[in-house]
């Protein structure tokens, strides 16, 4: 239904990462505006992006309010300049999004290694806790805050020299590996939730290497 | 349901190459590790090396390095073991098996195993 | 590499009995560790993880432990379908190593 002048959206995503949630749509708009409605299973609609010339409303100040719950969205169309027209059946044309919870599906930033330390034939490796927007009593968490120990940090280390990638594993955010005496090492790491079947990993944090600024050499 | 398969083993000389595939199904190696694990006839289990197909990243046993390449083809949802100049000690049955990157690192699934000979 | 020392070798056992096996890491791995068994002509399945921690669909007569490096599995009710071998592994770190396995037969 609708009015012959407004089409339907279509193509409704979710692209999160990091708990930072948008949801995008097409058509882009030719004579039309949307307004962006979302809930969860249980709760009232809540409208957001008003008469919005965009195809794509940031969702996240919702679904941070509990990322563990699962929302619906939904998007109306109606016709610029005379918003208060609806369809033949008394409502506006809309398009329901599909089903989205945070925590299972937000995709996973890149990490960055945020330090390396060298004592003698030991590599201490830290992983920078990145913020997200979910917040707690005013304050913003923390990736490991929000995961806590269903986030792993894999390491994948190499000497300079060499092509096969070593790997270790922490569900904290730091490594202690050892190393070769007077070898140089490159570092990347890859955050992940072993629990999830999909969106399980971020891309490679950028490879840090000794000898580079980052890091730090003691010998013993 | 997950499932790993193996195929391309039998019978190869001395000195040979073989190549073997790991196909997976009910879930997609991208976002996995995956292990190439060896039994030679009547002992143990011996680590052979892995891939991360989301990157490329591989290692492999020193008693492997430099004869044998893993490689991944996620468009096929496969992983290969490129195996040259094999040896006699290079017999046994080769598995796949996935890893959930979990921190204790265990190997959930495993394939079916397909038998390498390497005799002339 | 981290070497993972498995005993014994073999064991003989009757149905009913409680049976134990361990491992030692030549060095700390945390709780990185993994149990298998294994059957003739079979792949691997896996039974414990993190040391300590059942896999889903494995029988409450397995279980894991660890007390520093040591890392121990046991059957507390022996069963006939648990005749097999059993491996430890390590992954704290590449390359993943194994135990030489433990064959449990009937005795």
């Known amino acids: 239904s609708g009015t012959t002048n407004t089409v339907a959206a279509y193509n409704l995503t979710w692209k999160s990462t990091n708990f930072k949630t948008i949801l995008e749509w097409e058509p882009k708009p030719v004579n039309q505006v949307y307004t962006v409605q979302i809930s969860t299973k249980s709760g009232d609609w809540k409208s957001k992006c008003f008469y919005t010339t965009d195809t794509e409303c940031d969702l996240t100040d919702e679904i941070v309010k509990d990322v563990k719950q699962t929302y619906l969205a939904r998007v109306f169309s109606y016709p610029a300049g005379n918003v208060e027209s609806t369809g033949s059946a008394g409502e506006p044309l809309y398009e329901n999004s599909p089903e989205f919870t945070p925590y299972l599906e937000t995709n996973l930033g890149q990490p960055t290694i945020q330090s390396f330390e060298q004592v003698g034939t030991k590599v201490n490796v830290t992983v920078e806790d990145e913020r997200t927007l979910v917040r707690r009593n005013n304050t913003f968490l923390s990736l490991r805050d929000v995961f806590g120990k269903d986030l792993i940090y894999t390491l994948y280390y190499w000497k300079s020299s060499s092509s096969g990638k070593k790997t270790a594993k922490t569900n904290t955010n730091e490594f202690l590996i050892d190393v070769d005496k007077g070898e140089n090492y490159c570092f990347s790491v890859q955050a992940v939730i072993p629990s999830r079947t999909v969106n399980r990993k971020s891309t490679d944090s950028p490879v840090e290497c000794m000898g580079q600024e980052k890091g730090e050499f003691r010998e013993i | 349901e997950v499932q790993l398969v193996e195929s391309g083993g039998g019978l190869v000389q001395p000195g040979g190459s073989s190549r073997l595939s790991c196909a997976a199904s009910?879930?997609?190696?991208?976002?996995?590790?995956i292990h190439w694990v060896r039994q030679a006839p009547g002992k143990g289990l011996e680590w052979v090396g892995y891939i991360d197909p989301s990157n490329g990243y591989t290692d492999y046993a020193d008693s492997v390095k430099g004869r044998f390449t893993i490689s991944a083809d996620t468009s096929k949802n496969t992983a290969y073991l490129q195996m040259n100049s094999l040896r006699a000690e290079d017999t046994a049955v080769y598995y796949c098996a996935r890893d959930i990157q979990s921190v204790s690192g265990e190997f959930d699934y495993w394939g079916q195993g397909t038998l390498v000979t390497v005799s002339s | 590499d981290i070497q993972m020392t498995q005993s014994p070798s073999s064991l003989s056992a009757s149905v009913g009995d409680r049976v134990t096996i361990t491992c030692r890491a030549s060095q700390d791995v945390n709780t990185a560790v993994a149990w298998y068994q294994q059957k003739p002509g079979k792949a691997p399945k896996l039974l414990i993880y993190s040391a300590s921690f059942l896999y889903s669909g494995v029988p409450s007569r397995f279980s894991g432990s660890r007390s520093g490096t040591d890392f121990t599995l046991t059957i507390s009710s022996l069963q006939p379908e648990d005749f097999a071998t059993y491996y430890c592994?390590?992954?704290?770190?590449?390359?993943?190593?194994f135990g030489q396995g433990t064959k449990v037969e009937i005795k």
């Open positions: 009910g879930f997609t190696i991208y976002d996995y590790i």
């Open positions: 592994q390590q992954h704290y770190t590449t390359p993943p190593t």
